[in-house]
């Protein structure tokens, strides 16, 4: 799994007038890391992970650079023509990755009102855009604006690619990113459903990294995909993640079902509690 740094910048317009604020969220290896608006950048998440790892840094250069990027994006939004009345957003997402073989990847994506309309591979400088006419119009609009000062743009995008990787390497070197493994806490719960069925839910929480396999098995065999419902893998605010999987089974057959969990090379199975016990907890080490 590569190390990654992801910048998510958002600016807004109201009735065609670009608003003065902006919001930038930075994710490091998928973790919320920094949140910046105006002249403020705060380390995220505000949990023990942040305290232990991020220490008492001011994020001065990050604040300065990201504020500059926010201003640039506001100028870009001002050049998008035919903005309708009401609230509109322009989002720029920039991602750079360093893989285990030391190869790198960088990309940039623009979204208008949440819809992707333009992407660029920052290494090859290749642009791509969706086929819809709306996306094409927006893309032409923005690209023309970015091309107005071709030399500046060329330098700007080279710098974005280089700076992103430079910052990521700096964070890796300084120990901000820890290649750590935190095993999940697994809970299995049941809730009565109609007509002799019950819903069983398997929740995994407090794990890192985010890659996890969570599924229901009947007599040791995985249930088909369409009989299970999965939750997203989400940050829990403490530098770790949480997720869940649920399925509906016949009452009385609980002993045939187990929740299977695999994380960072370890795996475990968790039975459905009997009717009298609501929650069964187990935490493997």
């Amino acid at each position: 799994e590569p190390h990654s740094l992801r910048y998510n910048l958002t600016v807004l317009s109201w009735d065609g007038s670009v608003q003065s604020g902006f919001l930038t969220e930075v994710h490091l290896d998928g973790q919320p890391f920094l949140r910046c608006d105006r002249q403020k950048c705060r380390a995220k998440p505000q949990g023990q992970w942040a305290e232990d790892v991020l220490g008492n840094k001011t994020w001065d250069r990050e604040t300065r650079d990201l504020t500059g990027n926010g201003k640039d994006l506001r100028m870009t939004l001002a050049h998008i023509k035919d903005q309708k009345e009401g609230l509109h957003s322009l989002q720029e997402i920039r991602v750079c990755e360093i893989h285990e073989d030391n190869s790198t990847r960088s990309s940039q994506h623009f979204y208008y009102d949440g819809e992707l309309f333009l992407s660029q591979n920052l290494e090859t400088k290749e642009w791509t855009m969706p086929q819809s006419s709306r996306a094409q119009t927006l893309a032409m609009n923005v690209r023309n604006f970015l091309k107005e000062d071709a030399m500046k743009t060329k330098t700007h995008y080279h710098a974005m690619h280089a700076d992103c990787l430079q910052e990521l390497r700096r964070y890796l070197k300084s120990g901000v990113v820890l290649r750590r493994t935190v095993p999940p806490m697994v809970n299995v719960t049941r809730s009565e459903a109609s007509e002799g069925n019950i819903t069983v839910t398997c929740r995994a929480s407090g794990f890192y990294p985010w890659n996890i396999t969570l599924s229901w098995r009947q007599d040791g065999v995985s249930l088909s995909h369409d009989t299970q419902q999965w939750g997203d893998v989400l940050p829990d605010g403490n530098g770790t993640y949480q997720t869940w999987v649920a399925t509906r089974i016949c009452q009385g057959e609980e002993q045939r079902f187990t929740c299977y969990m695999e994380h960072s090379g370890n795996h475990s199975t968790h039975p459905v509690p009997s009717g009298k016990v609501l929650v069964l907890q187990s935490h493997w080490q």
Epitope: R38, Q39, K40, K57, T58, D60, R61, R64
Partner: antibody, heavy 117, light 107 residues
Framework: QVQLQQSGADLVRPGASVRLSCRAS????????MNWVKQRPGQGLEWIGM????????RLNQKFKDKATLTVDKSSNTAYMQLSSPTSEDSAIYYC??????????WGQGTSVTVSS | DILLTQSPAILSVSPGERVSFSCRAS??????IHWYQQSTNGSPRLLIK???ESISGIPSRFSGSGSGTDFTLTINSVESEDVADYYC?????????FGAGTKLELK
């Protein structure tokens, strides 16, 4: 042009709190942090803390956490610093300085505080 | 706290000479160093930010360099109006801290 106008010199009795003011003009007051810096006679500069006028968020040097209280009045574009229970150690010139990404780009003229009985 | 050590405490030079002020940080602060000039009975004035970035209105004879822990402010041709105290300030780690200063005198 950017200007920071600080209140006049203060002679205070030990233990009696004192409030210094810094009136900002020539820029958008709520968009910039405001720093406060202490300078003892013949000595160097010491950062006390900073406040963001938009929401009064403060960052205080732990050394001054029981000594200095930073506030702002957005309606008058004024930043304040209150010094509690002053002693002779608090006799100094106090500067307010506008923050520009953690550099102090504009400074007030300073307020001299003398603590004496 | 980050300790900034400025040396020497006093520099004595002749007009027209090139002079360098040193500031050493107790740990790596990348390029988060800023330089100020304070004339007698005056307020400090920002000269250089982020180690080497120039400030509008500051004469071009002032320049800065360095990264990590060692930083230098240079005046490439000293003038009489440059007689003052010079302070470095770091902004990488809370709390913000200043060096003890270097006094520039004319011979």
């Amino acid at each position: 042009q950017v200007q920071l106008q600080q209140s006049g010199a203060d002679l205070v009795r030990p233990g009696a709190s004192v409030r210094l003011s810094c009136r900002a003009s020539g820029y958008s007051f709520t968009n910039y942090w405001m720093n406060w810096v202490k300078q003892r006679p013949g000595q160097g500069l010491e950062w006390i803390g900073m406040i963001h006028p938009s929401d009064s968020e403060t960052r205080l040097n732990q050394k001054f956490k029981d000594k200095a209280t930073l506030t702002v009045d957005k309606s008058s574009n004024t930043a304040y610093m209150q010094l509690s229970s002053p002693t002779s150690e608090d006799s100094a010139i106090y500067y307010c300085a506008r923050d520009d990404f953690f550099t102090m780009d504009y400074w007030g003229q300073g307020t001299s505080v003398t603590v004496s009985s | 706290d980050i300790l900034l050590t400025q040396s020497p405490a006093i520099l004595s030079v002749s007009p027209g000479e090139r002079v360098s002020f040193s500031c050493r940080a107790s740990q790596n602060i990348v390029t988060s160093i800023h330089w100020y000039q304070q004339s007698t009975n005056g307020s400090p004035r920002l000269l250089i930010k982020y180690a080497s970035e120039s400030i509008s209105g500051i004469p071009s004879r002032f320049s800065g360099s360095g990264s990590g822990t060692d930083f230098t402010l240079t005046i490439n041709s000293v003038e009489s109006e440059d007689v003052a105290d010079y302070y470095c300030q770091q902004s990488n780690i809370w709390p913000l801290t200043f060096g003890a200063g270097t006094k520039l005198e004319l011979k």
